[in-house]
């Protein structure tokens, strides 16, 4: 999946299996990524687990779990708030669009989480105070989570180089160079560009991610995934000058 | 005013049960510098607070007492404390600590928010 870190680095990661997205004193978010096509290096998120840790008079420990084709509007115990404590309403799940869009507000830690199902896969977005982001007891282990450190270098796909490459190639050459060797050849570059431009008129990294995803999978749902990811940034990012990220040299992991 | 948070972090960093910075080690000076930094960060919201002024004077006192230089390494807090509370409430029966923005930032600017997102392939 494509990852935008807390420090506004943008990466495309091929991480497979379960990885920690966030792991701090209040919250643990784990994602499971699976290959989008057999033999493909590109992966997308098929499962998401969020653990809200027990916190003082506010919330009991609550677990939220979403999987492909299952985006519940409740915690695994069936509740929609933080439990029986006085401040239970400082943690709330709201269903925005049934089966497609859920928002979790954790007011006790100033945090908003948006989970969506777009096509077969899940997207995740969070707004969190820096103090909560950095509330990590053991930096050696907890500090390794993806939202903070990004993906390990050996798990990154240089999709910007792929994109530059794609502009000068036909679909046949592209499919061979693609991280998804079995990607359909019926999806020309021009079509991918047109589809992405429709939803993402600014040629930023979200637009480029969209093009990459269409060329890699042939699945037009990924256009919507990039579109909603940017919409979530607009809603959740505090710096409106940083909504769009643009091409730059590839980052080393933090 | 977050002065109690600064105090608690300093007490925690320099007290006995966690391999402390004893009062004649470089770690003690580092803990003092961290404490001074913490008090500076909260200064704007602590004007007129006696506990704050007591902390500032106490730091100066200990700095000179232990020959600590103002510059030098600071210590990392051993354990980040939980988001602090002020005296606003989300609703009448909800403890004030359960509303991060209202309670913590009642006296200061809004917190620095960060964003992380994951999507697509």
């Amino acid at each position: 999946p494509h990852l935008r870190t807390f420090t506004d680095r943008f990466q495309t990661c091929k991480v497979q299996g379960a990885w920690p997205l966030i792991d701090n004193n209040y919250l643990n978010v784990q994602v499971t990524n699976t290959p989008v096509l057999p033999g493909s290096a590109a992966t997308a998120t098929s499962k998401l687990t969020i653990i809200f840790k027990n916190f003082q008079e506010c919330v009991d420990q609550k677990v939220y779990q979403a999987e492909m084709d299952e985006l519940p509007a409740a915690f695994v115990d069936g509740s929609k708030n933080g439990g029986d404590k006085h401040g239970a309403n400082s943690l709330k799940i709201t269903e925005k669009v049934s089966g497609q869009h859920v928002e979790i507000q954790a007011k006790y830690i100033g945090t908003t989480i948006v989970v969506r199902q777009v096509g077969r896969y899940l997207t995740f977005a969070v707004r969190m105070p820096e103090e909560v982001v950095n509330a990590v007891e053991d930096w050696d282990s907890q500090g390794l989570y993806l939202c903070l450190r990004g993906c390990p270098l050996n798990q990154q796909i240089d999709f910007q180089a792929f994109h530059t490459n794609a502009e000068g190639t036909g679909a046949r050459r592209l499919a061979a160079a693609s991280p998804a060797p079995t990607a359909p050849e019926t999806f020309p570059y021009e079509t991918a560009v047109a589809k992405c431009k429709e939803k993402l008129p600014v040629e930023d990294l979200y637009y480029q991610a969209c093009v990459f995803d269409l060329l890699t999978t042939g699945d037009v749902n990924f256009t919507l995934a990039a579109y909603y990811a940017l919409e979530d940034v607009k809603m959740l990012h505090s710096n409106k000058d940083k909504l769009h990220l643009y091409e730059r040299t590839r980052d080393l992991p933090g | 005013c977050k002065i109690l948070k600064c105090n608690s972090e300093f007490w925690s960093a320099t007290s006995g049960s966690h391999a402390p910075a004893s009062d004649d080690t470089p770690e003690f000076c580092a803990a003092l510098r961290s404490y001074a930094l913490c008090t500076r960060r909260t200064a704007r919201t602590c004007r007129g607070d006696l506990a704050y002024h007591s902390a500032v004077h106490g730091i100066e006192d200990l700095m000179s007492q232990h020959n600590c230089s103002k510059d030098g390494p600071t210590s990392q807090p051993r354990l980040r404390t939980l988001p602090p509370a002020g005296d606003s409430q989300e609703r009448s029966d909800s403890p004030e600590i359960c509303h991060y923005e209202k309670s913590f930032h009642k006296h200061s600017a809004t917190p620095n928010y960060t964003h992380c997102g994951l999507f697509g392939d």
Epitope: - | K5, S15, D23, C46, Y52, S54, A55, P84
Partner: antibody, heavy 120, light 109 residues
Framework: EVQLVQSGAEVKKPGASVKVSCKAS????????ISWVRQAPGQGLDWMGW????????NYAQKLQGRVTMTTDTSTSTAYMELSSLRSEDTAVYYC?????????????WGQGTLVTVSS | QSALTQPRSVSGSPGQSVTISCTGT?????????VSWYQQHPGKAPKLMLY???KRPSGVPDRFSGSKSGNTASLTISGLQAEDEADYYC?????????FGGGTKVTVL
């Protein structure tokens, strides 16, 4: 004037719970911790724990863990100490004390004490 | 059994000096700036007399002084007066615990 005023004496049966209040005035409540200390008849002082009214963080004496709960209400500048599963050896005067300011940890202002008698 | 050890009692005549010791470990006393002393008269709440080993809060007479040597902190009352007859407790903050001494009864003969 800085003051801590505690609730009145209580008589409780074994197994019951007691909740003692401690109302602070004359200072910024969230800038000082509150410690709770008890003293059995004819005995020394026994530290029970402390709470930060600022963050809600608590630190309880190990031997009371699971039985003691300390809370604060910053809207009324009041600290509370609740002790459950009372036994006869919990009969004591319970004091709240303000934790001093600045780099030094000490208890500079004390409540008048609340006598809790546990008797069947 | 208290974590900090104090003598059960000490006594002196008016005008004399008495010293109360408070012995702990290196972490609870030896390396700590968190040793304080409290006076308690019968039926009353304790009163802070010294903090940070040697510092006197305002309102405490200067005949009360503190010192520390190794893992032992001491409170000295010089020029003992009748109103100094009381129990005295030392405490030390040791991170996850606040440690009290068992208390020392000071008697003015």
């Amino acid at each position: 004037e800085v003051q801590l005023v505690q609730s009145g004496a209580e008589v409780k049966k074994p197994g019951a719970s007691v909740k003692v209040s401690c109302k602070a005035s004359g200072y910024t409540f969230t800038s000082h911790g509150i410690s709770w200390v008890r003293q059995a008849p004819g005995q020394g002082l026994d530290w029970m724990g402390w709470i930060s009214p600022y963050s809600g963080n608590t630190n309880y004496a190990q031997k009371l863990q699971g039985r003691v709960t300390m809370t604060t209400d910053t809207s009324t500048s009041t600290a509370y100490m609740e002790l459950s599963s009372l036994r006869s050896e919990d009969t004591a005067v319970y004091y709240c004390a303000r934790v001093g300011s600045g780099p030094y940890y000490y208890m500079d202002v004390w409540g008048q004490g609340t006598l809790v008698t546990v008797s069947s | 059994q208290s974590a900090l050890t104090q003598p059960r009692s000490v006594s002196g005549s008016p005008g004399q000096s008495v010293t109360i010791s408070c012995t702990g470990t290196s972490s609870s006393v030896g390396d700590s700036i968190y040793v304080s002393w409290y006076q308690q008269h019968p039926g009353k709440a304790p009163k802070l007399m010294l903090y940070d080993v040697t510092k006197r809060p305002s309102g405490v007479p200067d005949r009360f002084s503190g010192s520390k040597s190794g893992n032992t902190a001491s409170l000295t009352i010089s020029g003992l007066q009748a109103e100094d007859e009381a129990d005295y407790y030392c405490i030390s903050y040791a991170g996850t615990d606040t440690l009290f001494g068992g208390g020392t009864k000071v008697t003015v003969l």
